[in-house]
């Protein structure tokens, strides 16, 4: 899994007039990390683990970045021509990633009223637009605005790419939290399914980093993919992750089945409770 930093900004307009303020959230490695507090006009960490990432440093840089990005997005919304009466939103999602081989990716995506209409691979400068005519119109509108001052735009997006990666590297380098290894807690449960069958579920929780192998084995051999159900690996709100895998087995054969877990080079097997 690559390390990633994801910015999600939203600005609003009412009856064609762009509203002051903006909404902003930042995710680090898929975990809620920062949000913009509109009352205090400050970037605020989301939970204790986010505070731990930067230790005792202030969030001034993050506040400045989010404020600047919010201002840019409001200007972009002001140039969208098709704003009818009522409430409209412009959302920008920006993601940068550092992969295991040290390669980087950076992209940004624009949504109008929740509908994707423009994406850019920032490294290559390739823009992509969905097929719908509304998306095409909106994309042309926004791209024309961005092109009005091509040099500023070029500098802005390359700086944005560099800043995102710089921030991500800064968090990764400064933070013991992001280099830690937290082994999962594994819990196996059973429930009656249909006559003669039971469903066994293996849950792994509170682990970090995100990469994990969780699978059911019968007589020591992994079951095929299509006989198991997997849950997504999801953040649990504490800077760690959780997931699950389930399968259906014949009652009385419980002792033949084990849940196999592998995480950060460690592995363990867990029997079905009788």
């Amino acid at each position: 899994e690559p390390h990633s930093l994801r910015y999600n900004l939203t600005v609003l307009s009412w009856d064609g007039s762009v509203q002051s303020g903006f909404l902003a959230e930042v995710h680090l490695d898929g975990q809620p990390f920062l949000r913009y507090d509109r009352q205090k006009c400050r970037a605020k960490p989301q939970g204790q683990w986010a505070e731990d990432v930067l230790g005792n440093k202030t969030w001034d840089r993050e506040t400045r970045d989010l404020t600047g990005n919010g201002k840019d997005l409001r200007m972009t919304l002001a140039h969208i021509k098709d704003q009818k009466e009522g409430l409209h939103s412009l959302q920008e999602i920006r993601v940068c990633e550092i992969h295991e081989d040290n390669s980087t990716r950076s992209s940004q995506h624009f949504y109008y009223d929740g509908e994707l209409f423009l994406s850019q691979n920032v490294e290559t400068e390739e823009w992509t637009v969905p097929q719908s005519s509304r998306a095409q119109t909106l994309a042309m509108n926004v791209r024309n605005f961005l092109k009005e001052d091509a040099m500023k735009t070029k500098t802005h997006y390359h700086a944005m790419h560099a800043d995102c990666l710089q921030e991500l590297r800064r968090y990764l380098e400064s933070s013991v939290v992001l280099r830690r290894r937290v082994p999962p807690m594994v819990n196996v449960t059973r429930s009656e399914a249909s006559e003669g069958n039971i469903t066994v579920t293996c849950r792994a929780s509170s682990f970090y980093p995100r990469n994990i192998t969780l699978t059911w084995r019968q007589d020591g051999v992994s079951l095929s993919h299509d006989t198991q159900q997997w849950g997504d690996v999801l953040p649990d709100g504490n800077g760690t992750y959780q997931t699950w895998v389930a399968t259906r087995i014949c009652q009385g054969e419980e002792q033949r089945f084990t849940c196999y877990m592998e995480h950060s080079g460690n592995h363990s097997t867990h029997p079905v409770p009788s």
């Epitope: 980087t104 992209s107 691979n121 290559t124 390739e126 992509t128 091509a150 735009t153 070029k154 390359h158």
Partner: antibody
């Protein structure tokens, strides 16, 4: 109809600089897209050399970066490739192409590096 | 850089048969930045399929593409004589853009 046409010398001496130009008709190189150079040595596969984008940004293949310069002349709607210190390994068909999924190509020009 | 490996290197089939060509990447690629090309001797390559599954202009419907992440496939449902050529995959997710080494589709 978008068309790309490569031009330049077919024979270059070792250690000299290879220079090629791609003339684009039917589309402005400042409107959109990346404008690429790609080469193919005899009997081998395709190798991306680099591009100049619609905004003027250049990107190069790291394996050639120290020897490559891609530039553009917007008044003539052309972009150019310069590859310095050439050797026999640079003998190839050189193509110019538009885009990121390369949707339009020139017909290619063969460059031989030989004394 | 992302290395693309195509398999098989050569595929020998007869007209009317189904062809399946594979392309595997060393790192995950966004499907919107993955493309296939066809090249015939003495000609420039031509775009066949863009963004994993979209037919380029003028390409017949017997060609199709699929895949995500690191594994992509080009399928020709029923081979026509003019389909025998070399096929290349290409990624545009990261710099440098890279091509697979090619699969030669030849008449059996």
């Amino acid at each position: 109809q978008v068309q790309l046409q490569e031009s330049g010398p077919g024979l270059v001496k070792p250690s000299e600089t290879l220079s090629l130009t791609c003339t684009v008709s039917g589309y402005s190189i400042t409107s959109d897209y990346a404008w690429n150079w790609i080469r193919q040595p005899p009997g081998k596969g395709l190798e991306w050399i680099g591009f100049v984008s619609y905004s003027g940004t250049t990107k190069y293949n790291p394996s050639l970066k120290s020897r490559v310069t891609i530039s553009r002349d917007t008044s003539k709607n052309q972009f150019s490739l310069k590859l310095s210190s050439v050797t026999a390994a640079d003998t190839a068909v050189y193509y110019c192409a538009r885009g990121y999924g390369f949707d339009y190509w020139g017909q290619g020009t063969t460059v031989t590096v030989s004394s | 850089e992302i290395v693309l490996t195509q398999s098989p290197a050569t595929l020998s089939l007869s007209p009317g048969e189904r062809a399946t060509l594979s392309c595997s990447a060393t790192s995950s690629i966004s499907s919107i930045y993955f493309h296939w090309y066809q090249q015939k001797p003495g000609q420039a390559p031509r775009l066949l399929i863009y963004r994993t599954s979209n037919l380029a202009s003028g390409i017949p419907a017997r060609f199709s593409g699929s895949g995500s992440g690191t594994d992509y496939t080009l399928t020709i449902s029923s081979l026509e004589p003019e389909d025998f050529a070399v096929y290349y995959c290409q990624q545009g997710t990261t710099i440098p853009f890279t091509f697979g080494q090619g699969t030669k589709l030849e008449i059996k």
